[in-house]
């Protein structure tokens, strides 16, 4: 009897190890999306960026969905969200329309159930990019911890999208689940 | 018999609690490395920073290795990587040769198996630090979620290293494992 | 007998699932605190910000305490700490006392046992906000991984608090526990 119980115990331990490992993995959605440079919109006002890579280079996604330019949450939880946005201008690109620029990023959450959009995080700077310098660069980083529900969507808006640095190490955003909701 | 089973169950629970706790700890490597100010290189172009503290002040490391100026991954996984780099100039610091500065950070990953280096994240700004002000300061923060394999190395490159703020709260980088690779 | 054992095993699995889930949640304190705009101090020097929301909008807290303007750690562990601070000025707000500004944030840790305060992270920039532009904006983001002990307190200090952007998406700080201390 005692031997049988030990065997069962071993099974409990074994199956638990698998279950714990598997459930841990499944409980941790993530995404790291990098800018798709072939499809950056123009304009200087606030524009939503809808083209991102999720399956090449540093881009990756698991247990979340990328659709219509939005990162869709599939699993309720508390997530750490982040974005890194780089802007740049070289004099060879032509003259800037204005030397006074507002370079901004807005990380927004949209709920489909209650059709509304809210800014979770914003960052940026006003810049004076004078003609005395042949090259200008500026990066913004934002990050924060948010409760997200299944079906909610995360999107990125920026000002002056034509100034975006198209490199995958420069302009990206992402999320990873840290814990469940009580 | 039933009593015996309950005792076994308690053992299962107990050993499991230990096992789960222990495996959770072992599954979570991390590092927070702060700049070693006694060994900051000179130069104006991209320079690799190789001197960091991992065992004093806020510096710490666990289940990762710091060697030859690089943070070495010992355990496959998805990690959140971050860096905070501060630059500063005071009129007493020395004769600044130019007001137009490119203050940049690059977080790079090197694979020894396939000897190649790739930039995971970059950030920074071009700055105009005029002599009309006696003090100048600027900080960069970058962060992102990346798949790292055992043996891969993370390093930090900056422009204008002699302008780095040598405080441990100013110039640092780090990583922590968030989840396993499926 | 064997049937009885299987029932016990199911109980082990069931209780374990609850226990693991519950202990995981309890092991993961977090906070995301947003600025309380009704109580921003004045001055241009380093000032501690003591008014934050923890229970409205994006503000939230769990297994940590907010008291006297400080975020109090209730559980030993390694935490990821972050802050996002936005400064802004519009010409309609009146003239700035000076065009040369030092816009800074300091994330500090205070230990009650050993009454001392240490800066964990700092960031910011010197800015020239000239009268040639009607609007100025600048954001700082810092983040890092730190060992925190129960009873320790996290607080935020900034320069030029009267220039703070009072939006919840602009000025906030937070923490979440990543792992236990060995």
């Amino acid at each position: 009897g005692s031997q049988h119980i030990r065997a069962e115990k071993a099974m409990v331990d074994g199956s638990w190890l698998d279950l714990a490992k598997r459930s841990k993995l499944e409980a941790q959605p993530f995404a790291h999306l990098t800018i798709n440079a072939t499809d950056i919109p123009s304009g200087s006002h606030k524009v939503s960026l809808s083209s991102w890579y999720h399956d090449r280079g540093w881009g990756k996604i698991s247990n979340m969905t990328f659709s219509n330019g939005k990162l869709i949450v599939n699993q309720d939880g508390f997530y750490y969200l982040y974005a890194n946005i780089c802007f740049r201008h070289h004099e060879t690109s032509g003259d800037l329309a204005t030397e006074y620029l507002q370079l901004m990023v807005y990380v927004t959450k949209t709920s489909i159930k209650i059709p509304s959009s809210h800014t979770l995080m914003k960052g940026g700077s006003t810049k004076y990019w004078s003609g005395n310098s042949e090259f200008h660069f500026y990066s913004i980083n934002v990050g924060g911890f948010f409760k997200l529900r299944s079906g909610e969507e995360i999107s990125i808006e920026v000002s002056n999208p034509s100034l975006l640095d198209p490199d995958q190490d420069a302009t990206y955003f992402g999320a990873f689940k840290v814990r469940d909701i009580d | 018999g039933s009593q015996h089973i309950r005792a076994e169950k308690a053992m299962v629970d107990g050993s499991w609690l230990d096992l789960a706790k222990r495996s959770k700890l072992e599954a979570q490597p991390f590092a927070h490395l702060t700049i070693n100010a006694t060994d900051i290189p000179s130069g104006s172009h991209k320079v690799s920073l190789s001197s960091w503290y991992h065992d004093r002040g806020w510096g710490k490391i666990s289940n990762m290795t710091f060697s030859n100026g690089k943070l070495i991954v010992n355990q496959d996984g998805f990690y959140y990587l971050y860096a905070n780099i501060c630059f500063r100039h005071h009129e007493t610091s020395g004769d600044l040769a130019t007001e137009y500065l490119q203050l940049m950070v690059y977080v790079t990953k090197t694979s020894i198996k396939i000897p190649s280096s790739h930039t995971l994240m970059k950030g920074g700004s071009t700055k105009y630090w005029s002599g009309n002000s006696e003090f100048h300061f600027y900080s960069i923060n970058v962060g992102g979620f990346f798949k790292l394999r055992s043996g891969e190395e993370i390093s930090i490159e900056v422009s204008n290293p002699s302008l780095l703020d040598p405080d441990q709260d100013a110039t640092y980088f780090g990583a922590f494992k968030v989840r396993d690779i499926d | 007998g064997s049937q009885h054992i299987r029932a016990e095993k199911a109980m082990v699995d069931g209780s374990w699932l609850d226990l693991a889930k519950r202990s995981k949640l309890e092991a993961q304190p977090f906070a995301h605190l947003t600025i309380n705009a009704t109580d921003i101090p004045s001055g241009s020097h380093k000032v501690s910000l003591s008014s934050w929301y923890h229970d409205r909008g994006w503000g939230k807290i769990s297994n940590m305490t907010f008291s006297n303007g400080k975020l109090i750690v209730n559980q030993d562990g390694f935490y990821y700490l972050y802050a996002n601070i936005c400064f802004r000025h519009h010409e309609t707000s009146g003239d700035l006392a000076t065009e040369y500004l030092q816009l800074m944030v300091y994330v500090t840790k205070t230990s009650i046992k050993i009454p001392s305060s240490h800066t964990l992270m700092k960031g910011g920039s010197t800015k020239y906000w000239s009268g040639n532009s009607e609007f100025h904006f600048y954001s700082i983001n810092v983040g890092g991984f730190f060992k925190l002990r129960s009873g320790e307190e996290i607080s935020i200090e900034v320069s030029n608090p009267s220039l703070l952007d009072p939006d919840q998406d602009a000025t906030y700080f937070g923490a979440f526990k990543v792992r236990d201390i060995d």
Epitope: N132 | S42, G94, L96, A97, E99, Y100 | -
Partner: antibody, heavy 122, light 107 residues
């Protein structure tokens, strides 16, 4: 061709003033810090003034501080040295020199002019 | 101010000889040393910077080494056109100071 050409040297009495000029060509002048270096007859080299690329920082050794003023006009690709309260020991060949790119706090010189002679004598 | 002491003040060597000049700084300058060549009646030319880096277009017979306070400049095989005075300069901290010079003559 990268070139620096000095002018404005001459004979001046002690206590007098002189303004040296340096015309730059063949490179983007506004991107470089510049300096004046002098060489007394039969002697070694002595750095006397430096100016940042944008002109808002100026630097001098104690020997000339308060008497010499370095300036630049980036629109004209020109560097200047205003020398007041001249002394006999200021007699030298004055070279205009371009600071090479490098660490922002370190100055060494990769392009030199041909020099202009300043003689301070009564 | 950092003093730079150069030695010898002059030397005479034959074509093909290896010539070595030393420069001593009064304090640690890490590797922030430049070397210049000044031919008679001409302006100085940059040869070496940051102790050991050859400037663009400088022949490989010219080299530099050292760190801290002691530095060496070497001409591996002296050529007739190397007749000149050679100066070291510290570019570590302002004011930028030069050594007294070493006059190299051809035997």
């Amino acid at each position: 061709e990268v070139q620096l050409v000095e002018s404005g040297g001459g004979l001046v009495k002690p206590g007098g003033s002189l303004r040296l000029s340096c015309a730059a060509s063949g490179f983007t002048f506004r991107n470089y810090a510049m300096s004046w270096v002098r060489q007394a007859p039969g002697k070694g080299l002595e750095w006397v003034a430096g100016i940042s690329s944008g002109g808002t920082y100026t630097y001098y050794p104690d020997t000339v501080k308060g008497r010499f003023t370095i300036s630049r006009d980036n629109a004209r690709n020109s560097l200047y040295l205003q020398m007041n309260s001249l002394r006999a020991e200021d007699t030298a060949v004055y070279y205009c020199a371009r600071r090479d790119y490098g660490d922002v706090y370190e100055w060494y010189f990769d392009v030199w002019g041909t020099g202009t002679t300043v003689t301070v004598s009564s | 101010d950092i003093q730079m002491t150069q030695s010898p003040s002059s030397l005479s060597a034959s074509v093909g000889d290896r010539v070595t000049i030393t420069c001593k700084a009064s304090q640690d300058v890490r590797t922030s040393i430049a070397w210049y060549q000044q031919k008679p009646g001409k302006s100085p030319k940059l040869l070496i910077y940051s102790a050991s880096y050859r400037y663009t277009g400088v022949p490989s017979r010219f080299s530099g080494s050292g760190s801290g306070t002691d530095f060496t400049f070497t001409i591996s095989s002296l050529q007739p056109e190397d007749l000149a005075t050679y100066y070291c300069q510290q570019h570590y901290s302002s004011p930028w100071t030069f050594g007294g010079g070493t006059k190299v003559e051809i035997k």
